[in-house]
């Protein structure tokens, strides 16, 4: 399911509940994705010892994964709502190719991997409605993404396991940073 339970307008389980605001919906959506990532990480960690690897070792697998930095305006110091929102949306769009890579990488959590991917697409739509400056958001080039995907899928098994772990870890961190920032908006 791309949205958390109870988010659908047809949900009649709690007819007297106030409809969620845009911010509440975004917050709930991120936490829903984070729960999905948590489940995927459990499978990855049970399958290999990648989770014990330090960030320094992982960094050698030079993936260009989106990461928050001071200049992005999402931290407490130098917080800038508009700059930060652009960074969050841009980062999520950049993560999409990596989430595509994660499909078929899981045995018992295949549906969970699909749910994380679809939920992220919904989250991007929610955030784009919130953003005023959509022109500042750069969309990744589909051709570049296609060749990156081919390259990642051609790696040996060990590197694929490492890549999977690193994507999940980085995506989790990016969403946590985003959630902290969005709660200030």
């Amino acid at each position: 399911a791309p949205v958390p339970p109870g988010e659908d307008s047809k949900d009649v389980a709690a007819p007297h509940r106030q409809p969620l605001t845009s911010s509440e919906r975004i917050d709930k959506q991120i936490r829903y994705i984070l729960d999905g990532i948590s489940a995927l990480r459990k499978e990855t960690c049970n399958k290999s010892n990648m989770c014990e690897s330090s960030k320094e070792a992982l960094a050698e697998n030079n993936l260009n994964l989106p990461k928050m930095a001071e200049k992005d305006g999402c931290f407490q110091s130098g917080f800038n709502e508009e700059t930060c929102l652009v960074k969050i949306i841009t980062g999520l769009l950049e993560f999409e190719v990596y989430l595509e890579y994660l499909q078929n990488r899981f045995e018992s959590s295949e549906e969970q991997a699909r749910a994380v991917q679809m939920s992220t697409k919904v989250l991007i739509q929610f955030l784009q409605k919130k953003a005023k400056n959509l022109d500042a958001i750069t969309t990744p080039d589909p051709t570049t993404n296609a060749s990156l995907l081919t390259k990642l899928q051609a790696q040996n098994q060990w590197l694929q396991d490492m890549t999977t772990h690193l994507i999940l870890r980085s995506f989790k961190e990016f969403l946590q940073s985003s959630l902290r920032a969005l709660r200030q908006m």
Partner: antibody
Framework: SVEESGGRLVTPGTPLTLTCTVS????????MSWVRQAPGKGLEWIGY??????TWYANWAKGRFTISKTSSTTVDLKMTSLTTEDTATYFC???????????????WGPGTLVTVSS | NIVMTQTPSPVSGAVGGTVTINCQAS??????LSWYQQKPGQPPRLLIY???TLTSGVSSRFKGSGAGTQFTLTISGVECADAATYYC????????????FGGGTKVVVV
């Protein structure tokens, strides 16, 4: 394990740096927090340093307290313009990551006492 | 600015009885609330997180409930060892906050 060090008796206005040393923990994977407790009082949160390297502080701590990861096993708390009100036991605590978003503190050090007195 | 308010303090409970501690957030914090136990001369110890999930190794006599702004810690079958100060902590927002902890509730066992 988590252990704090650097607490001592200082005079008002003196800067002081406390160090939190962890063992068996990869600091790059965990959020860390500093919390203090004045004698006979409750817990008072100072700030967090998250895995994304961002630092978030309590309103009263901004500008006077600085948290930084100084190595893969140490986190510092730099304090300036200390007053007698800063007399407290300072705790360092590790955040948990088995759930995806949650700032619960599941491992605490024994604390280090800072006394500010003239 | 989220403020955490704990009541009552102190609270007394008889051995074998039940003690209830309340924690109120000034605005919704979803289920991002933890409970800690602290005994004199010791650091706090995490009991419950996500409002109701018991930390590994903690007795099932401790039960957390609530969501949004109202939370409760219930200790059933109170033992002498439960005499301590209990703190709630919000994990929802770390900006524009004076303290993520509640003021604490001292439990006296009689």
């Amino acid at each position: 394990s988590v252990e704090e060090s650097g607490g001592r008796l200082v005079t008002p206005g003196t800067p002081l740096t406390l160090t939190c040393t962890v063992s068996g923990i990869d600091l790059s994977s965990y959020d860390m927090s500093w919390v203090r407790q004045a004698p006979g009082k409750g817990l008072e949160w100072i700030g967090y340093i998250y895995t994304d390297s961002s630092t978030w502080y309590a309103n009263w701590a901004k500008g006077r307290f600085t948290i930084s990861k100084t190595s893969s096993t140490t986190v510092d708390l730099k304090m300036t313009s200390l007053t007698t009100e800063d007399t407290a036991t300072y705790f360092c605590a590790k955040g948990s990551t088995d759930y995806a978003f949650d700032t619960r503190l599941d491992l605490w050090g024994p604390g280090t006492l800072v006394t500010v007195s003239s | 600015n989220i403020v955490m308010t704990q009541t009552p303090s102190p609270v007394s409970g008889a051995v074998g009885g039940t003690v209830t501690i309340n924690c109120q957030a000034s605005q919704s914090i979803s289920n991002e609330l933890s409970w800690y136990q602290q005994k004199p001369g010791q650091p706090p110890r995490l009991l419950i997180y996500r409002a109701s999930t018991l930390t590994s190794g903690v007795s099932s006599r401790f039960k957390g409930s609530g969501a949004g702004t109202q939370f409760t810690l219930t200790i059933s079958g109170v033992e002498c060892a439960d005499a301590a100060t209990y703190y709630c902590q919000q994990g929802y927002n770390s900006n524009d906050v004076d303290n993520v902890f509640g003021g604490g509730t001292k439990v006296v066992v009689v």
